[in-house]
Each structure stands twice: as C-alpha cells, then as structure tokens.
Interface confidence: low
C-alpha cells in the first residue's frame, strides 16, 4: 500500500552509569549504537499494526525504544504500556523523519510488556507493537549441589542442576573450625564428582559456573566431639535429598552404631555404614542416614547412639518454603567520629542466602558467619564514618529480607552560607541537628552581637541525602537590611560554627568564614 | 536446535593473527546474540566478545578490546573471531556460543542457550 509510511524501530542499549537514575529522556548516557528491530507489519491484524522484534533486556540495564517515521506533515502520538497512556513527544530530525522515544530506565520486572505506540499522520493511523522482556535468566541457573549414594559402591556423588554445566568439586578438611576457611592450607580440593574418602571432619561439595559458586555441608554429628549447647539444626525443604553422617573413633572395632527417628529405628536401606582404621590404629566408623526425597513426615530428632559414646541428636525440619527469620525492624545508631562500629543482621534461613549491604546507591560485599546456636550474623564495618541510610538485603530463592540502618556521626556544625536578592540561607548537616541564630553586624555591633528577631525561617531536616539530615536556616531580607553584614550561627551539644553573609552587594557574594 | 562447530584454531607466534570461524547449522542462526568464550587450562571459562543479531553491536572484554573483532555473515550461518597482537595469555580453548531465542538480547554476557565443541588456540614462540 503506497499510503503506508516507511517505519524503522531502533533499540538503543545505554551503558548505565548511576547518575543516569530517574532521569529525563534527554539526559545524556553512553549509548550503543542503535539495532534495528526489524518493524514488520502484523498479518491479519485489523488496522494497520507494525511488530518490533522482541527486546530482551537484562534487570537494571535502560534502554531507548524508538520509532523513526518517513512520512509528510505532522505526526501526533501516544504510548500505552499496560492499559495507562503515556505521554509521547515527536520530534524531527535532520532527515526530517518523525522520531518517537519511549525510555526505560533501569529496568524491572514491572517494565517487562507490551509497549503499544499509536501514532496519526495527516495520510494514515497506525500501531506498533513492541514487546520487552527481562532476560530469561532461566537459561542460566546455578542450584545448589546435593549428594547421592553411588549404586553398588560406599561413595557419594554430588550433584548440580545447573546450565551451563558446572564444575563440581569436594572441599575437604580434617581440622577444626577457623581452621577449614577456604584458602586454609588444611583444606584439601578435589575436582570431581563422586568422593570415596568419606571420614574426614568436613565434607563440602561445590559446584560453579558462570553464575558464581553455590556449596552445600555434609551435615555431621561428631561423637567424640563435646556436643553444642543449642541443639543443631537442619533444614531441608520438601523433596530435597536428606544426608545425616554420624561419625565416631574408639580405640578398637567393638563398638556399633545406630540412627533412630523419634526413637524408632530408621528402616532398612536408609542407612549405610563405613569402617577404617587410622594412623595410630583406633577405629573409625561412619553411619550415614539418608531419605532420597523428603517428606513432612521426616521431620524429627534423629539420634545417633553408639555402645561406647553418649548418643547426640539432631532437630531435623521439613519446610514446604524457604524462609529468611529476622527482626526488620529498622535501627538507628550515633556514635562518635572515631567510634568504631560494626552494623549487624542476626538471622536463621534456608536456603542460604545471598546478601548485599547498600549504602549511596553502592553495593558491597556482604559475609556472613555461622553461630552455635543455629542462627547466621553478617556485619557491615566498611561506613568509614559516613552518616546515611544503610541497607541490608538478603535473598534465597523463596524469600526476601530487607533490613534499614541509619548512622549519625556526632559532631559540631559545618555551616555553608549563600544569599540571593531577596535572602540569605545557610544549612549544616551536624548531628545532632543545630539550632540556628542569626546576628547582625553594624557600627553599634562590630562584633554581631545584634539578634535579628525577624525574617527567620528554620528548617529542620529538610532533605534526606541518602538518609543524612540537612537542617537549614532561611532569613527573609528587608530593605532595611541591604548592604548589611549578618551573620548565621549553628550550635549543638558539640559546638558551634558562624558564617557571615555580606548582603545584597554587586556581584558574587563574598563569604568571611568566621572561626 | 542449533549445533555450532569451530575452526581455525592453531598453533601462532606471539605479535601473530588468527581467524576463529563458527558455523551454524540450523535456520534461526540470524535470531541468535552469538559470543566467544575461552577456556585456558587449570582456569574458569570466561567471556571474550559477543555480536547481537543484526552484527549493530559488538562487545568485548577488557583484556581483547583493540586487537579482537568479532563479526558475522548471517547469509552464511557463520560467525568470525579476528585475533591480532596474539599473546601468550590468549592461550585457550576458544568456544562459540549462542545466546537467548529473542533477536534482541541487551547484555555484554549474552545467555547462552548452545555451546560448540571448542577450538584450540597455542601463542608460542
């Protein structure tokens, strides 16, 4: 049909930097070059309706989805993105095309859609249809590994889910505690799938890929160890495999051991048991208690009791979901300037979960440390001093935490002063927040002694600067005033700083710092 | 399905070039992002540039950006890795890839759907 324009669809990738947020369209951001999305009319479709190719963008990234539009005379338009209308503004450029533009930025589950542009020219009305999707990261997945026995053999395989294929591999270690840290020279790596040597004291198994890297433990109760105060604790969700190894050493072979749920003994084929002999000729067996899919009935206390060590036990949970435990309750702390300070999230979850602690729009790296009583701790001490918002986030597949800290450093005013030609404004981020005086300088008060009663308006806290309160101080000028010095104090319980304020003179304003 | 073979790897001196060809069997060759990944021995397999449907837009790794270009000719189902300035560290088993089913795919580690068998790259003098 001659009367149809000629139609490109372009998507322009921006390379985000962060100052780009919430930005208008017309801020400037490194872009790619633009990719034709090839616009290719709907068949069968009642109208006139042009179809993009499918934009597939990854969570955060922003993205410009324009339509450049070879037509006569002027062109009127509007976006629709899930039944609400958006505003829409055509422009021409040098080749006198329309251009339309719609901007995603930083991109959320909540853009993903169909992104539907109605325009009219004075020849014809037309559609096109775009349709954005977050990137299927379904095609990328990193599970975490769980173990198997070996048909016919006393060995255990590990095994991942994972697309790419990962790499798999044990991490062993025969010390204790702070000790088995991963680059520990007690730790031991063995790239491969099944492991034989199953007494050691640790047992990990680890697969990566180019998600990162996901571990799970061999849960172990250890008879010769002095049991935990708390009792320990595993978690499974429903279905997940259960592995339980007991572990005990006796000087000779005469000893046995048993595993029993709530005091029953476990079923034939869901316990396998291994012996050897070590270096100085005890003996060493291990009984493992396993179920290939769990249910909820598995839930309970499993016990392991030997003839020649006092039984230990084990809180087993089933768990239909997994769960983050947590006070989120938001906290607010103030210290000194050279306080030391840790924030800190004591939690209990599973799956494990993946954390990050935000502060000014920037992530850092968030560890975390297993307690005895079953719980986790991960602590923030990297704040340098700087007041603000701190967020902790946590994630594992099934659920979410968030967590909101507030730090005040406590110290005397810093005060920043400008004046235009109707007032005066001076403000101080000093905590806690100052109150404010204002004093007038003339031949009767060299030394500003003079109080201004009126035209002062305070703000307390005025605006949050990544949760860092700012309180200002405004003073309205009289005609009387102009030409006036004045001056604006901050104090608190820490001190007090002055700046003084030529008012209403030509030029710049000059500022006399005022110690 | 899409199966991706590779060529062109060898044996080239340090200062050297090198042509990487990957071709694609299959139809929807053109609606794949295609990207080259390398694996060097006792190392993490990582990513080395990517070339989005149309070939409008490249992206590179740090360490390859200026002596690396990648490139394809979607009439011939073929993807190219033109490797100048080689070094020593460029030693690596070379992997073709294929990303996400969409024409479009917005990221410098595309998703990757089809992995070819690997090509071997020696830098030696």
């Known amino acids: 049909n001659q009367d149809l324009p000629v139609i490109k669809c372009v998507l322009i990738n921006h390379k985000n930097n962060d100052s780009s947020v919430g930005k208008s369209s017309s801020y400037p951001m490194v872009s790619e070059s633009p990719e034709d999305l090839g616009c290719a009319l709907r068949p069968q479709s009642a109208g006139t309706v042009y179809e993009a190719a499918t934009v597939e963008v990854d969570v955060s990234a922003s993205i410009t989805l324009q339509v450049l539009v070879d037509t006569p005379g002027n062109i009127s338009c509007l976006w629709v993105f899930k039944h609400s209308s958006l505003n829409c503004q055509p422009h021409f450029d040098v080749q006198n095309r329309g251009v339309v533009s719609m901007v995603i930025l930083k991109m959320t589950e909540t853009q993903a859609g169909e992104y539907l542009l109605f325009i009219q020219s004075e020849a014809t009305n037309y559609t096109i249809v775009f349709t954005v999707s977050i990137r299927n990261t379904l095609l990328f997945t990193l599970r975490r590994p769980y173990f198997r026995k070996m048909e016919n053999q006393d060995a255990l395989v590990c095994i991942s889910e994972s697309v790419p294929e990962p790499i798999v591999e044990w991490v062993l270690c025969d010390s204790q505690g702070e000790s088995c840290k991963e680059e520990s020279p007690a730790v031991v790596k063995k790239e491969e799938k099944v492991l034989h040597e199953l007494f050691g004291t640790d047992i990990r198994c680890c697969a990566r890929n180019e998600l990162g890297r996901e571990c799970t433990r061999l849960f172990t109760i250890d008879l010769n160890q002095t049991p935990q105060t708390t009792l320990p604790q595993l978690f499974l969700k429903v279905g997940e495999p259960l592995w339980i190894r007991c572990k005990a050493v006796h000087v000779n072979h005469g000893f046995g051991l048993t595993w029993e749920l709530e005091n029953k003994a476990l079923e034939e084929g869901s316990y396998f048991e291994m012996s050897t002999y070590s270096t100085n000729r005890t003996m060493i067996r291990i009984l493992f208690a396993f179920v290939s899919s769990v249910a909820r009935n598995d839930t309970g206390y499993y016990t392991c009791s030997s003839s020649k060590h006092p039984s230990q036990s084990a809180l087993v949970t089933i768990v239909e979901k997994g769960f983050i435990n947590a006070t989120n309750s938001s906290e607010d702390y103030e210290i000194d300037q050279y306080e030391e300070f840790c924030f800190s999230v004591r939690f209990k979850a599973y799956p494990q979960i993946r954390c990050t602690w935000t502060f000014s729009r920037k992530a850092f790296p968030c560890e975390q440390k297993a307690l005895d009583d079953g719980y986790s701790v991960s602590k923030f001490c990297n704040h340098k001093h700087q007041p603000g918002e701190y967020i902790f986030h946590a994630e594992n597949g099934d659920a979410q935490f968030t967590k909101m800290f507030t730090l005040n450093i406590r110290r005397k005013p810093q005060v920043l002063a400008e004046a235009s030609a109707s007032q005066a404004s001076c403000s101080s981020d000093g905590y806690p927040l100052p109150s404010w005086t204002w004093k007038k300088c003339s031949d009767k008060s060299p030394n500003c002694t003079e109080d201004i009663p009126e035209g002062v308006w305070n703000r307390k806290a005025n605006r949050k600067v990544f949760g860092q309160w700012v309180s200002s101080s405004t003073l309205n000028m009289s005609e009387a005033m102009k030409g006036f010095l004045v001056k604006c104090c901050a104090y608190n319980s820490l001190g007090t700083s002055c700046e003084t304020i030529l008012l209403n003179s030509p030029g710049p304003f000059p500022f006399i710092q005022d110690s | 399905e899409v199966q991706l073979l590779e060529s062109g790897g060898g044996l080239v001196q340090p200062g050297g070039s090198l042509t990487l060809s990957c071709a694609a069997s299959?139809?929807?060759?053109?609606?794949?992002?295609m990207g080259w990944f390398r694996q060097a021995p006792g190392k993490e397999r990582e990513f080395v540039a990517a070339?989005?449907?149309?070939?409008?837009?490249?992206y590179y790794a740090d360490s390859v950006k200026g002596r690396f270009t990648i490139s394809r000719d979607n009439s011939k189902n073929t993807l190219y890795l033109q490797m100048n300035s080689l070094r020593a560290e460029d030693t690596a088993v070379y992997y073709c890839?294929?990303?996400?089913?969409?024409?479009?795919?917005?990221?410098?580690?595309?998703?990757?759907?089809?992995w070819g068998q690997g090509t071997l790259v020696t830098v030696s003098s």
């Open positions: 890839a294929a990303g996400g089913s969409t024409r479009v795919v917005v990221t410098t580690t595309p998703v990757v759907k089809y």
């Open positions: 299959g139809r929807t060759f053109s609606s794949y992002a």
């Open positions: 070339i989005s449907w149309s070939g409008s837009n490249t």
